[in-house]
Interface confidence: low
């Protein structure tokens, strides 16, 4: 018996061939012997089956001795053995219809689980293999689950269903809703303007929700809400904003915040949370601000940084074009009685300079100049 696999919603064509290459009497029945369709001369006749409005044939092929059964908009319950009767012969074809669907929605938040459910006819024992856009293979039976979805899981998942040595392929487009970066860090000299950007890693027609930026300043004992906002069809409107600092927010995506001045009291970590309409759960992006200050007080030249720096970062003070006078894995370095000239305070990671502040040290009778 020939086995044909079909996909729910698709069209399938079951073949039936006579030895005579001409139009002769034929008809198709299901396993209950109920007539589906056949011919009377050059006319197509249909029987009382449930397939009535979805069954068809190709009259153009009858003259060649081919009498196909075409079933449109396949349903799982169309799985059956179909019998073609022609020239006193019976050709049997077993049709197995499968469907593969994603749980609830194909737009899922980062960290959520994706469950793919296989609809299959009773008595079948299919195996499924799915390949994610990043090339990860998963196998299973009636359900496949992937926990903790990552950004790279966005895209087309290709799933192959295997039954009776036959394969049928499904493609499901999954969109993982997330920020492009889980975390970012901004390095600024004291007094500079700070730009925070929160680009999303997906595009959708309409985007509605609300968000908030909580900030934990290094010097503060508790965190505070810096800004809350609404998102309506990709338009941003500020609901509430703190007065210190005076934050400004862009009106369009990507989400964009401006802090007029980087000051030591603002250095710290923030968490931007975005709750999207009709989604359970929230998107998060961490943002960090590191602020540097170089000062000269009497005979002491000091360089300090505030904010979340990792222990591997190096803070150095050096006279321009000379070797570093002092380099430490600490948040403050200083030089006593610095010689006159342009001094550089450098924050670096494995030799790469992340932040630099210059201060001009004048002879002791002058006042220091901060460029």
């Amino acid at each position: 018996k020939k086995v044909v696999l079909g996909k729910k919603g698709d069209t399938v064509e079951l073949t039936c061939t006579a030895s005579q290459k001409k139009s002769i009497q034929f008809h198709w029945k299901n396993s209950n012997q109920i007539k589906i369709l056949g011919n009377q001369g050059s006319f197509l006749t249909k029987g009382p089956s449930k397939l009535n409005d979805r069954a068809d044939s190709r009259r153009s092929l009858w003259d060649q001795g081919n009498f196909p059964l075409i079933i449109k908009n396949l349903k799982i319950e169309d799985s059956d053995t179909y019998i073609c009767e022609v020239e006193d012969q019976k050709e049997e074809v077993q049709l197995l219809v499968f469907g593969l669907t994603a749980n609830s929605d194909t737009h899922l938040l980062q960290g959520q689980s994706l469950t793919l459910t296989l609809e299959s006819p009773p008595g079948s024992s299919p195996s499924v293999q799915c390949r994610s856009p990043r090339g990860k293979n998963i196998q299973g039976g009636k359900t496949l689950s992937v926990s903790q979805l990552e950004l790279q899981d966005s895209g087309t998942w290709t799933c192959t269903v295997l039954q009776n040595q036959k394969k049928v392929e499904f493609k499901i487009d999954i969109v993982v809703l997330a920020f492009q970066k889980a975390s970012s860090i901004v390095y600024k000299k004291e007094g500079e303007q700070v730009e925070f950007s929160f680009p999303l890693a997906f595009t959708v027609e309409k985007l509605t929700g609300s968000g908030e930026l909580w900030w934990q300043a290094e010097r503060a004992s508790s965190s505070k809400s810096w800004i809350t906002f609404d998102l309506k069809n990709k338009e941003v409107s500020v609901k509430r904003v703190t007065q210190d600092p005076k934050l400004q927010m862009g009106k369009k995506l990507p989400l964009h915040l401006t802090l007029p001045q980087a000051l030591p009291q603002y250095a710290g970590s923030g968490n931007l949370t975005l709750a999207l309409e009709a989604k359970t759960g929230k998107l998060h992006q961490e943002v960090n601000l590191v602020v540097m200050r170089a000062t000269q007080l009497q005979k002491n030249l000091t360089c300090e940084v505030w904010g979340p720096t990792s222990p591997k970062l190096m803070l150095s003070l050096k006279l321009e074009n000379k070797e570093a006078k002092v380099s430490k894995r600490e948040k403050a370095v200083w030089v006593l009685n610095p010689e006159a000239g342009m001094w550089q305070c450098l924050l670096s990671d494995s030799g790469q300079v992340l932040l630099e502040s210059n201060i001009k040290v004048l002879p002791t009778w002058s006042t220091p100049v901060q460029p």
Epitope: S127, Q129, Q148, E150
Partner: antibody
């Protein structure tokens, strides 16, 4: 308990081919990918490629593309790795290992030493 | 391909010591990192999968942590049978890649 049993040690001449087998027993290993990983003497682990026996899907490391062929016989639950155009630097222990959903190798074969020498 | 860098390449420790091995990926691998133990002449053995999940049958003195690019394998109290070579492996992107290994020797 899943077990992966590999074929015995081989001594080969440069330019020839070697085919190593890996028989799975005691579990539904056909549903899983079987990867091949090699380890040169005193060196680290190097991924060569893999197959999902149930589907015949193969993936190869670029370094071995064209020289390695991984196959599987579902009826005997056996995976095979054939490496052609052997050179002395292919002298290594070749392992088969079962891959889980998380991309880790939870069961390993005992290893097959292939020595390439003229 | 993603490069996996293990450090240190070797270390000497005594029974009862707390041992930490680090593994760094050249780009984010989320939590798709696995740790293996290998003894001379034997196949590697899975200890930790998905960065921090302990493989069944592995003693609880082994633990894993980290996500993104930096990961750690910790042995809280080194036992005589723990002297071996340890490998990390990323499974986030094809092809899977291994770290160079860390040999834990008796002091």
């Amino acid at each position: 308990q899943v077990q992966l049993v590999q074929s015995g040690a081989e001594v080969k001449k440069p330019g020839s081919s070697v085919k190593v087998s890996c028989k799975a027993s005691g579990g539904t290993s056909n549903n899983y990918a079987i990867d091949w990983v090699r380890q040169a003497p005193g060196q680290g682990l190097e991924w060569m490629g893999g197959i999902i026996p149930l589907f015949g899907t193969t993936t190869y490391a670029q370094k071995f593309q064209g020289r390695v062929t991984i196959t599987a016989d579902e009826s005997t639950s056996t995976a095979y790795m054939e490496l052609s155009s052997l050179r002395s630097e292919d002298t290594a222990v070749y392992y088969c290992a079962r891959v889980t959903l998380y991309g880790d190798y939870d069961y390993w074969g005992q290893g097959t030493l292939v020595t390439v020498s003229s | 391909d993603i490069q996996m860098t293990q450090s240190p390449s070797s270390l000497s420790a005594s029974v009862g010591d707390r041992v930490t091995i680090t593994c760094r990926a050249s780009q984010s691998i989320n939590r798709y990192l696995n740790w293996y133990q290998q003894k001379p002449g034997k196949a590697p053995k899975l200890l930790i999968y998905a960065a921090s999940s302990l493989q069944s049958g592995v003693p609880s003195r082994f633990s894993g942590s980290g996500s993104g690019t930096d990961f750690t394998l910790t042995i809280s109290s080194l036992q005589p049978e723990d002297f071996a070579t340890y490998y990390c492996q990323q499974a986030n992107s094809f092809p899977p890649t291994f770290g160079g290994g860390t040999k834990v020797e008796i002091k």
